[in-house]
C-alpha cells in the first residue's frame, strides 16, 4: 500500500494506491483511492506513467479529458465515473500488454487540496492449473496443466500424506511456448502416486501463485484450484 500526501502543507489530501498485476490479454485495474469531495466538478484525476510523455488518462469536471493522452493508451483507459465522487480514482486498462508494466502516478486535485501516490504495475500471464489422473501412463500418474504463464514459473508438487516430501525426482515439468511467442503452457507430471491422498501442484512466478489440488480415492476424484496475486502492496 502506498499512501501519498500533497506537498502544499495543510492543502494536502491522502491518495492511496495498491501495487497490482495485470494479466496480459485481459482488462486490468490500477487501484487508486482518495479523500472524496462533495462536488464532482471540483475533482481532477490524472494518471501518469514514468517514461511516457503524454498522460495515461485525465478526468476533470465530471468527464474524461483525453486531449493530452499518450498514443499508447488511446482507446484503452477508463475511470469508474460513477465512483469518482466517493473517492475511487482507479483506472481500467483494456487488453493489458507486457509493455504496460512500470511505475504509474495517480495524481488528484480536489477543493481540499492535492495529493499523489505511485503504483508499481507488473504484467505477466497467470492461469488456473487443472490436475487430472493420466490414465494413459503405465503407472499411477497425475498431470497438472496450466495454459498461460509468463515469466516462466516454478512448479512444485506436494502431498497431504507425505508433508515436506521432495517430489522433484518423481516429477517432470515442461514449458511449451504458446502461439503468440510470449506466454507458455505449463505441464507437470507426477509419477508413482498413491490412492487416498491429496496432491497439490503449485505454480508460482513473481506475479502470481496458483494451486491445483486433486484427491484420488477408490470411489471418486475431487479437484480444487485457486490463484492468488503476490504483489498487492498498498502505497
Amino acid at each position: 500500500l502506498i499512501i501519498g500526501f500533497g506537498i502544499s502543507g495543510r492543502h494536502s489530501i491522502t491518495v492511496t494506491t495498491v501495487a497490482s498485476a495485470g494479466n496480459i490479454g485481459e482488462d486490468g485495474i490500477l487501484s487508486c483511492t482518495f479523500e472524496p469531495d462533495i462536488k464532482l466538478s471540483d475533482i481532477v484525476i490524472q494518471w501518469l506513467k514514468e517514461g511516457v510523455l503524454g498522460l495515461v488518462h485525465e478526468f476533470k469536471e465530471g468527464k474524461d479529458e483525453l486531449s493530452e493522452q499518450d498514443e499508447m493508451f488511446r482507446g484503452r483507459t477508463a475511470v469508474f465515473a460513477d465512483q469518482v465522487i466517493v473517492g475511487n480514482a482507479s483506472l481500467r486498462l483494456k487488453n493489458v500488454q507486457l509493455t504496460d508494466a512500470g511505475t504509474y502516478k495517480c495524481y488528484i486535485i480536489t477543493s481540499k487540496g492535492k495529493g499523489n501516490a505511485n503504483l508499481e504495475y507488473k504484467t505477466g500471464a497467470f492461469s488456473m492449473p487443472e490436475v487430472n489422473v493420466d490414465y494413459n501412463a503405465s503407472s499411477e500418474t497425475l498431470r497438472c496443466e496450466a495454459p498461460r504463464w509468463f515469466p516462466q514459473p516454478t512448479v512444485v508438487w506436494a502431498s497431504q500424506v507425505d508433508q515436506g516430501a521432495n517430489f522433484s525426482e518423481v516429477s517432470n515439468t515442461s514449458f511449451e511456448l504458446n502461439s503468440e511467442n510470449v506466454t507458455m503452457k505449463v505441464v507437470s507430471v507426477l509419477y508413482n502416486v498413491t490412492i487416498n491422498n491429496t496432491y497439490s501442484c503449485m505454480i508460482e512466478n513473481d506475479i502470481a501463485k496458483a494451486t491445483g489440488d486433486i484427491k484420488v480415492t477408490e470411489s471418486e476424484i475431487k479437484r480444487r484450484s485457486h490463484l492468488q496475486l503476490l504483489n498487492s502492496k498498498a502505497s
Epitope: 490479454g25 482488462d27 483494456k94 498461460r148 502461439s179 506466454t183
Partner: antibody, heavy 116, light 109 residues
C-alpha cells in the same frame, strides 16, 4: 494486409446446429479481443460474443447464452462460433470483428437463415 | 444495462451540408470506449471514430467526433455523395460488454 473471412452460414432448421468460422490473416488473432456481431435483415448491429486476447475471458449477449460457444484456434489463426438450438430470431448476417481500438476490421459476413 | 440511443432516426440533407448525429447513453460511458461506424447497403461496417474523437486510419477529416459522459456527437462537416449511409455508435466495457446504438440513416434530400 489484415483480412477476416467468415464461412459456414447456411439455411438450417429451428433447433439445428451450425459452426461458423472466421479465418484471420495479416495479424495474430491472439493479440486482439475478437467478437462476433450479427445483423438481422433490415435491422441494426447486435454484439453476440467476445473472447479476450488471452482466451481466458468469454462473454455472450443474454439471448445466446447456453446455446452459442465462441472459441479460437491460435495455430490456425481462426475464430469460431458454435451455434446450437437455433431459433428463427437468430437469422442474420454474422460478422467476426477485431477490436483494436474499436472494431477496426470486419469480415464480409456470412448469412445464417433459420427456417423450417 | 447500458442503452445507446441515436438521434435522429433518419436525417435528410443535401450534399455539401453539415450533418450532426447524436448518441446518448443511459449511463456514463468512458470516452476511450466510444466508437462510430459507417455502413453502406450490402457492405460491412467501417470504423470512423474511436475514443470518441480520434479518426480511424484513412478516414477523411470532414468526419469528427466529440462529447463525453452520456452525450456524444458525430459531425460530418461537408457531406459528400458517398457519405449517405447508416451510422452507428458503440460502447465497450459496461453490461452488456459491447452495445450498439440503433443507427441513424443519413439520406440524400
Amino acid at each position: 494486409q489484415v483480412q477476416l473471412v467468415e464461412s459456414g452460414g447456411v439455411l438450417v432448421k429451428p433447433g439445428g446446429s451450425l459452426r461458423l468460422s472466421c479465418a484471420a490473416s495479416g495479424f495474430t488473432l491472439s493479440d486482439y479481443y475478437m467478437s462476433w456481431i450479427r445483423q438481422a435483415p433490415g435491422m441494426g448491429l447486435e454484439w453476440v460474443s467476445y473472447i479476450s486476447s488471452s482466451g481466458s475471458t468469454i462473454y455472450y449477449t443474454d439471448s445466446v447464452k447456453g446455446r452459442f460457444t465462441i472459441s479460437r484456434d491460435s495455430a490456425k489463426n481462426s475464430l469460431y462460433l458454435q451455434m446450437n438450438s437455433l431459433r428463427a430470431e437468430d437469422t442474420a448476417v454474422y460478422y467476426c470483428a477485431r477490436d483494436g481500438v474499436g472494431f477496426d476490421y470486419w469480415g464480409q459476413g456470412t448469412l445464417v437463415t433459420v427456417s423450417s | 444495462e447500458i442503452v445507446l440511443t441515436q438521434s435522429p432516426g433518419t436525417l435528410s440533407l443535401f450534399p455539401g451540408e453539415r450533418a450532426t448525429l447524436s448518441c446518448r447513453a443511459s449511463q456514463s460511458v468512458s470516452s476511450s470506449y466510444l466508437a462510430w461506424y459507417q455502413q453502406k447497403p450490402g457492405q460491412s461496417p467501417r470504423l470512423l471514430i474511436y475514443a470518441a474523437s480520434s479518426r480511424a486510419t484513412g478516414i477523411p477529416d470532414r468526419f469528427s467526433g466529440s462529447g463525453s459522459g452520456t452525450d456524444f456527437t458525430l459531425t460530418i462537416s461537408r457531406l459528400e455523395p458517398e457519405d449517405f449511409a447508416v451510422y452507428y455508435c458503440q460502447q465497450y466495457g459496461s453490461s452488456p460488454l459491447y452495445t450498439f446504438g440503433q443507427g441513424t440513416k443519413l439520406e440524400i434530400k
